[in-house]
């Protein structure tokens, strides 16, 4: 008789794929004309990325550092009207993209939480949560919570409102902190909170250090659902050496939890790479005309259009990974086991019951390395085969689908491999 299938865990929509942050509507759409009506026209692009949620805004009225002139219920007319927002929600729903609204109050000001009037701001947030939940949003994000006095109790209250409306709604909190103890204390009072932080960016970017960061985080947070990013708002290129960009995309998509990206991460967009751009919100490079000020400043391989036509581009890798992440059980909710491999490498397995299993091998080093996989660390339920099929490599030159002998596996500098192998009873 075949062994009984393991019962599937309860899956919320944010467990099923990546979240995509658009913190600046105008920079995302380019040409200084970004609004909600225009964003509706970009939903097909987001669908092509297979992201599950769009983290949008803030969009509300906020006169820099002025509580009285900050209204979390009113959309800033520069972004459009409430009707435009409702239309965007409807269109996103049709494409199965959830919309999460950033309600960080003083987003144009110095202290994002108006340090002197925390209580009245917290009341405004409470009202806004209810208002926008009834409007149909799927969740909220608040950032810089380390600057919010009594953050844990406010977050608990806001999570109660959000979950009280529906268990299917999500609250995301962001912090600049990279301190694991601080992160854990914020998570402890909120069972379903998704927390983005700078935890992973406080790294020496070696295989060993990354492995220890990931395992410490997972151990400290127990069996709760995690999110993975390098910051609460910034671009990957602002935190990573360029040569590790592909490696990190592979890692973020295959760790157990929700990967969270910022617009432009999929094409390697750089903050302030082009003259005159604001550092925090570079213009999204849709095509070569996205930066008309300086002719020739943008080459095709920097743009969405150019990378869409190139199967070896970062964007193509992102789409492939996002696709795998959203459909493979082992990557959706599989168990996670790291094991020993050569110095400079970080290797792990994702597996779920009798489904196809995945092996991830990441070479953070500047030199080619033998994988040196040592399966002795693995539990019996997750043993390694002698061969596994290549799903993808972060570097060109390998044939997808080809079987690779694990004992002889060698990786190029900064190469990451995603391999698959079947469950054997």
């Amino acid at each position: 008789r075949a062994p009984r299938c393991r019962e599937l865990p309860a899956q919320k929509w944010w467990h099923t794929g990546a979240l995509y942050r658009i913190g600046d509507l105008q920079a995302f759409q380019g040409h200084g004309s970004g609004n909600l009506a225009g964003l509706k026209g970009r939903l097909d692009y987001l669908s092509s990325l297979k992201v599950k949620g769009l983290v949008l805004g803030p969009l509300h009225k906020n006169q820099k550092d002025d509580v009285a002139q900050t209204d979390l219920l009113q959309i800033d007319p520069n972004f459009g009207s409430k009707e435009d927002f409702d239309n965007l929600l409807q269109s996103a729903k049709k494409k199965s993209i959830r919309v999460i609204l950033d309600l960080t109050p003083n987003y144009r000001g110095e202290n994002l939480w108006f340090s002197t009037q925390v209580d009245s701001v917290a009341t405004k947030v409470k009202d806004a949560l209810e208002f926008w939940l009834q409007a149909g949003v799927d969740g909220f994000q608040v950032r810089d919570i380390e600057n919010l006095k009594d953050a844990s109790s406010f977050l608990a209250e806001w999570e109660n409102i959000t979950k009280g409306f529906s268990e299917d709604r999500l609250l995301i909190a962001g912090t600049n902190s990279s301190d694991l103890q601080q992160i854990v204390s914020l998570l402890e009072s909120n069972k379903d909170l998704l927390l983005t932080s700078s935890y992973l960016s406080d790294s020496s970017f070696t295989g060993e250090h990354t492995k220890s960061l990931v395992t410490q985080y997972l151990n400290a947070t127990g069996n709760r659902w995690c999110s993975w990013s390098l910051s609460q708002a910034g671009l990957l290129t602002s935190f990573l050496p360029a040569q590790l960009l592909r490696l990190y995309q592979l890692m973020l998509f295959t760790l157990p939890g929700t990967p969270v990206f910022s617009y432009g991460d999929e094409i390697g967009l750089k903050a302030a790479a082009l003259p005159g751009q604001p550092v925090e919100a570079p213009v999204m490079l849709w095509d070569e005309s996205s930066f008309p000020d300086i002719p020739g400043a943008v080459s095709a391989n920097m743009t969405v259009k150019g990378q869409s036509e190139d199967p070896g581009s970062l964007l193509s890798l992102f789409r492939q990974l996002s696709d795998q992440r959203s459909k493979e059980r082992s990557l959706l909710h599989g168990d996670f086991h790291t094991f020993s491999s050569g110095p400079g490498l970080f290797s792990y397995i994702r597996h779920w019951d009798q489904n196809e299993r995945f092996l991830v091998v990441l070479n953070f080093g500047d030199v080619g390395l033998s994988a040196g996989l040592q399966a002795s660390d693995l539990p019996a339920s997750a043993s390694l085969p002698t061969k596994a099929d290549l799903v993808l490599s972060t570097q060109p030159g390998r044939e997808e689908g080809s079987p690779l002998e694990l004992e002889r596996l060698k990786l190029e500098p900064h190469e990451g491999l995603l391999l698959r192998f079947p469950y054997v009873a």
């Epitope: 009341t123 405004k124 009834q134």
Partner: nanobody, 125 residues
Framework: QVQLVESGGGLVQAGGSLRLSCAAS????????MGWFRQAPGKEREFVAT????????YYADSLKGRFTISRDNAKNTVYLQMNSLKPEDTAVYFC??????????????????WGQGTQVTVSS
């Protein structure tokens, strides 16, 4: 059970002002989101304004912003609608409503559990 009674309606000339009041029964008034809606002859009921439990947050129909102001006095269990620069198209029956589930009432009338009988506002040109 919450009972709501509107008052303050009447006949006014275009450009004039009116202040509507809505008195609520019950000791938990400060825990309701409150809203005003209106219904013109032959038309559907439409949203006017809403105010949160504490009165901290307000929200208005786009077309009325700047002319109408919603406020509340929790000590008196009353919510108000100050209407300035009235126009003939503001002629309607004005209803007040209580949302007992949410502190922040909403723009759709489905969320409101309790309604008043309405007060007639007529603006002549």
């Amino acid at each position: 059970q919450v009972q709501l009674v509107e008052s303050g309606g009447g006949l006014v000339q275009a450009g004039g002002s009116l202040r509507l009041s809505c008195a609520a029964s019950g000791r938990t008034f400060s825990r309701y989101g409150m809203g005003w809606f209106r219904q013109a002859p032959g038309k559907e009921r439409e949203f006017v304004a809403t105010i949160s439990c504490s009165g901290t947050s307000t929200y208005y129909a786009d077309s009325l912003k700047g002319r109408f102001t919603i406020s509340r006095d929790n000590a008196k269990n009353t919510v108000y609608l100050q209407m300035n620069s009235l126009k003939p198209e503001d002629t309607a029956v004005y209803f007040c409503a209580a949302d007992t589930r949410h502190c922040m009432g909403y723009t759709k009338d489905g969320g409101y559990a309790y309604w008043g009988q309405g007060t007639q506002v007529t603006v002549s040109s």
